[in-house]
Interface confidence: low
């Protein structure tokens, strides 16, 4: 079965900034991946990012950069101008369209109590695959 | 212009073989997923095949499996079907459709080509 | 799959008035819904999708709702070129879609 990780990192040079790192664990060719946060994807989440294995990146602020890491995981780099971070108690989803496997979404986010450097554990959330 | 045009539909017995083409234009074929979806004369659409844009992935419906095979020339800029083992309730009206690549729907479609499949 | 159902099958509408057209998932697709409208002996045509965000050119009288297993497609002060045949899709994998709904003129 297809599963998504989500790793969140605080920067450790800088507070303000943070980085996603999501990945892709099983068959098939990924067709997209979209990033979001404060929920998953049209569901309540705003859409941070989309990346094209073929047409590139789509990135809207506060994302930085995006960019694929390896051909089934991708970074996506955050920078708060805001004195106090929000992105601390944020949920970061990644939902990969898989083909022709369908759409796999998991999400996670940084523990308040995070060290800078270190990542959250990957929190799943409901997954639909529709076949 | 995004174009899509079909071609190679008709009139086949039962048993028989078709095969449809779809010339694209407009846009960077090899850069999207395409798919051909049919409408029944009683109107419904259902997905009958798609193709990853290189070519490497596809997906069928369990009523085509076997049957039919969808393939691409991305240096001809061109989609194709071919139908073997044709069937009665294969006869409808055939679309060509090109993914969008921001969500998993189809944002442009060909004017199709109708097979008919009788004897 | 997932099956979509759409209702009303049929409706008559005047120019003017404003409708609306339901579609159910038989499971939970989050917003991962679009529509189309396809006019007589014409190709469908990408109207909606994550269920509310219209499609490049679409007008604003068009607009869609819902999540989960509940979606609507609403077209206010109807025109006569938005008389034809909608239909919903579920873009949350492999797709399928509703039965259509045909809006006829009364």
């Known amino acids: 079965t297809p599963e998504v990780w989500v790793q969140v990192q605080m920067e450790a040079t800088e507070l303000s900034s943070f980085t996603v790192h999501c990945g892709f664990l099983g068959p098939g060719s990924i067709s997209l991946v979209t990033v979001s946060w404060g929920g998953p994807d049209g569901a309540g989440g705003t859409k941070l990012a989309v990346l094209h294995p073929e047409l590139g990146t789509r990135q809207w602020a506060p994302a930085r950069q995006a960019r694929w890491e390896t051909q089934s995981s991708i970074s996506l780099a955050l920078e708060d101008s805001g004195a106090s971070s929000p992105f601390a108690n944020t949920t970061f989803c990644c939902k990969f369209a898989s083909f022709p496997e369908g759409s796999w979404e998991s999400c996670g986010s940084l523990p308040p109590s995070s060290d800078p450097g270190l990542s959250a554990p990957p929190t799943p959330v409901p997954i639909l695959r529709a076949d | 212009e995004v174009k899509l045009v079909e071609s190679g539909g008709g009139l086949v017995q039962p048993g028989g073989s078709l095969k449809l083409s779809c010339a694209a234009s407009?846009?960077?074929?090899?850069?999207?997923?395409m798919s051909w979806v049919r409408q029944t004369p009683e109107k419904r659409l259902e997905l009958v095949a798609e193709?990853?844009?290189?070519?490497?992935?596809?997906h069928y419906p369990d009523n085509v499996k076997g049957r039919f095979t969808i393939s691409r020339d991305n240096a001809k800029n061109t989609l194709y079907l071919q139908m073997s083992s044709l069937k009665s309730e294969d006869t409808a009206m055939y679309y060509c459709?090109?993914?969008?690549?921001?969500?998993?729907?189809?944002?442009?479609w060909g004017q199709g080509t109708s097979v008919t499949v009788s004897s | 799959d997932i099956q979509m159902s759409q209702s009303p099958a049929s409706l008559s509408a005047s120019v003017g008035e404003t409708v609306t057209i339901t579609c159910r998932a038989s499971?939970?697709?989050?917003?991962?819904l679009a529509w189309y409208q396809q006019k007589q002996g014409r190709s469908p045509q990408f109207l909606v999708y994550n269920a509310q965000t219209l499609a490049e050119g679409v007008p604003s009288r068009f607009s869609g709702g819902g999540s989960g297993t509940q979606f609507s497609l609403k077209i206010n002060s109807l025109q006569p070129e938005d008389f034809g045949s909608y239909y919903c899709q579920h873009h949350y994998g492999n797709p399928t879609f509703g039965g259509g709904t045909k809006l006829e003129i009364k």
């Open positions: 459709a090109r993914h969008n690549w921001d969500v998993y729907a189809m944002d442009y």
């Open positions: 193709l990853s844009n290189s070519g490497g992935s596809f």
């Open positions: 499971e939970n697709v989050n917003s991962y």
């Open positions: 407009g846009f960077t074929f090899s850069s999207y997923t």
